[in-house]
């Protein structure tokens, strides 16, 4: 058992042209909230139960009212983490959907209304117990920045939260058949037995003998479904509901996909993933040949000259599925290394590399100073993926090719005159001042503010600054 945690950092307009209009207005103030849905595995083809790993809704964010004429800023966010408890092992690979919802708070009859602002999705690998992973996803003109992690709930440990640990009862060794829990060598693996009769589908335990219920179930053995709270009431036409959730038929109940197709839910409807030889909304069209043009999105059809022989679609980059019907979010596989930004251009994948890295996948770490000569005795200094030259005295510029004017910065104080010199600069001080930069006044009695003038120099002499 454990918890998947999601921290939303910002939601606002993405970079580039076409900034979205603010979702709120003075007439219709609104606030945001988020929903996360998790499924195990990386495969888009998997016909898992919807949100089989779990789902969570955030709290509502602060109320926001657009300032007239102002561009949409990053919008105020709800406090806290979204937490999705998982009862069994953490799968290590998972798919996510994060939805940004808007709750309008205008004076509609019947209270606030919900609408979906943006939805992002991806597939990731993640070990439980690891550090926070940061991510940026774009949906249209919106950009969502977030971090996530999976952590085990005691007594579970390990990258999959499958091993259970308990403090040792004996100081020397664990009980029969039970191993030490590395790295917690002072703890032992322990069996965990829930309360007798605890529902295996709707209950779980974190301590022996207990029975804790999953959301939607109650009772001592988690066998009683919780009825949803009332959320519809007759308030007159066009009442906007408060966004309550009501139980209903499963979107894929009875599997509407024919011919062995697998069904997955979408918010309004469902989607069928069809086996080879079938296509259509419900995989109902069969006997397909290449002459029927079954390959979408520019896929190349091979074989299938007659209805009894199978055809194969060779999909162009960016598409997959037996009929090339699915767009691949290739960036979700994080192909760009060393923090490079992934751009899926449809026809190709591009990595925009951070400074100091190069290559198709930003895999090459550049030696910043390789082949970069600094002129006039300057030395090359590497740093942060860029090179710079530390120039010898009297030279400046990116490659030390420019002769520096040491007097350009007017270094002589109190009206002193500056002279360039082969070894630096010289200040000729105005009467009454002395020092390398003419910074010290000479006292009227002839004594200077310095403890003693350097030998061989009288006040008023030009001072050479080395």
């Amino acid at each position: 058992a454990g918890v998947f945690e999601l921290q939303i950092h910002s939601f606002g307009p993405g970079p580039g042209p076409g900034a979205p209009r603010s979702p709120c207005s003075a007439r219709l103030p609104c606030r945001l909230f988020f929903r996360v849905c998790l499924k195990p595995g990386l495969s888009e083809e998997a016909a898992e139960s919807p949100c089989a790993l779990g789902a969570a809704l955030s709290a509502r964010g602060p109320v926001y009212t657009e300032q007239p004429g102002a561009p949409a800023p990053d919008l105020p966010l709800p406090d806290g983490l979204l937490q999705v408890p998982f009862r069994d092992a953490w799968p290590g690979t998972f798919s996510f959907i994060i939805e940004t919802w808007r709750e309008e708070l205008g004076d509609q009859i019947g209270g606030p209304a919900w609408s979906l602002l943006a939805r992002v999705a991806g597939r990731r690998r993640l070990a439980a117990g690891g550090p926070w992973a940061r991510d940026i996803q774009r949906a249209g003109a919106w950009e969502l920045r977030f971090s996530y992690r999976a952590r085990c709930e005691p007594p579970a440990v390990g990258t999959a939260c499958t091993r259970l640990c308990r403090p040792r009862s004996a100081p020397s060794r664990c009980g029969p058949g039970l191993r030490p829990c590395a790295p917690l060598e002072d703890e032992c693996e322990a069996p965990l037995v829930c309360r007798a009769g605890c529902s295996p589908e709707h209950g779980f335990c974190e301590q022996p003998g207990e029975c804790r219920c999953l959301e939607g179930w109650t009772g001592p053995l988690c066998t009683v479904p919780v009825s949803t709270s009332s959320c519809l009431s007759p308030r007159g036409p066009s009442s906007a509901t408060t966004g309550c959730l009501v139980p209903g038929p499963g979107p894929c109940d009875g599997n509407p996909c024919a011919n062995g197709g697998s069904c997955s839910e979408t918010p309004r409807s469902f989607e069928c993933t069809c086996p080879r030889g079938f296509y259509g909304l419900r995989c109902e069209v069969s006997g397909v040949t290449c002459a029927d043009g079954p390959c979408f999105n520019g896929g190349l059809c091979v074989g299938g000259a007659d209805p009894d022989s199978a055809y194969i679609c060779h999909c162009p980059p960016g598409f997959q599925g037996s009929n090339c019907e699915k767009r691949v979010d290739r960036c979700s596989l994080q192909p760009c290394r060393n923090g490079g930004l992934c751009l899926d251009l449809g026809h190709a994948l591009r990595c925009r590399c951070r400074a100091g890295f190069a290559g198709p996948r930003c895999e090459h770490d550049l030696d910043d100073c390789a082949g970069r000569a600094c002129a006039n005795g300057g030395t090359c200094v590497e740093g942060g993926g860029a090179h710079r030259c530390s120039c010898a005295l009297g030279f400046g510029g990116r490659d030390c090719r420019e002769r520096a004017d040491p007097c350009a910065a007017r270094p002589c104080a109190h009206g002193g005159r500056c002279y360039a010199h082969f070894s630096g600069l010289v200040c000729a001080c105005a009467p009454g001042y002395m020092g390398a930069r003419c910074e010290f006044p000479v006292h009227p009695d002839g004594a200077s503010a310095l403890p003693a003038a350097p030998p061989g120099l009288r006040p008023g002499d030009p001072q050479r600054y080395l």
Epitope: S49, A113, L214, E215, L232, S238, G243, L245, S269
Partner: nanobody, 126 residues
Framework: EVQLVESGGGLVQPGGSLRLSCAAS????????IGWVRRAPGKGEELVAR????????RYADSVKGRFTISADTSKNTAYLQMNSLRAEDTAVYYC???????????????????SGQGTLVTVSS
């Protein structure tokens, strides 16, 4: 402005039929999924039928399967619920609403409702 207005409710004997209508304005029903939700006295809400006119997708709760039929006329921007073989346990206020599949939890599928109408009362009694 989004509006949903239900009609067609009334008193009917067990075994009888009714046809409920849901007239929509302010949006195009062909682009949304419309559901009929009912609330019986002392019970929680239940989504009994859904339709997505774009692809003809329909779904029914087990309690009404084979007896209720949901349909839509996109030219009239109206959804319908044909209720046959009515039983006493079908007595409820029926609302139409824009509905979106939200999540699955502990054996239940849950739907978020966007806008709903004012409801129409269906009473099945002898």
């Amino acid at each position: 402005e989004v509006q949903l207005v239900e009609s067609g409710g009334g008193l009917v004997q067990p075994g009888g039929s009714l046809r409920l209508s849901c007239a929509a304005s302010g949006f195009n029903i062909s682009e949304e999924s419309i559901g009929w939700v009912r609330r019986a006295p002392g019970k929680g809400e239940e989504l009994v039928a859904r339709i997505y006119p774009t692809n003809g997708y329909t779904r029914y709760a087990d309690s009404v399967k084979g007896r209720f039929t949901i349909s839509a006329d996109t030219s009239k921007n109206t959804a319908y619920l044909q209720m046959n073989s009515l039983r006493a346990e079908d007595t409820a206020v029926y609302y139409c609403a824009r509905s979106y599949y939200a999540h699955y939890s502990a054996g239940y599928y849950y739907y978020a409702l966007d806008y709903s109408g004012q409801g129409t009362l269906v009473t099945v009694s002898s």
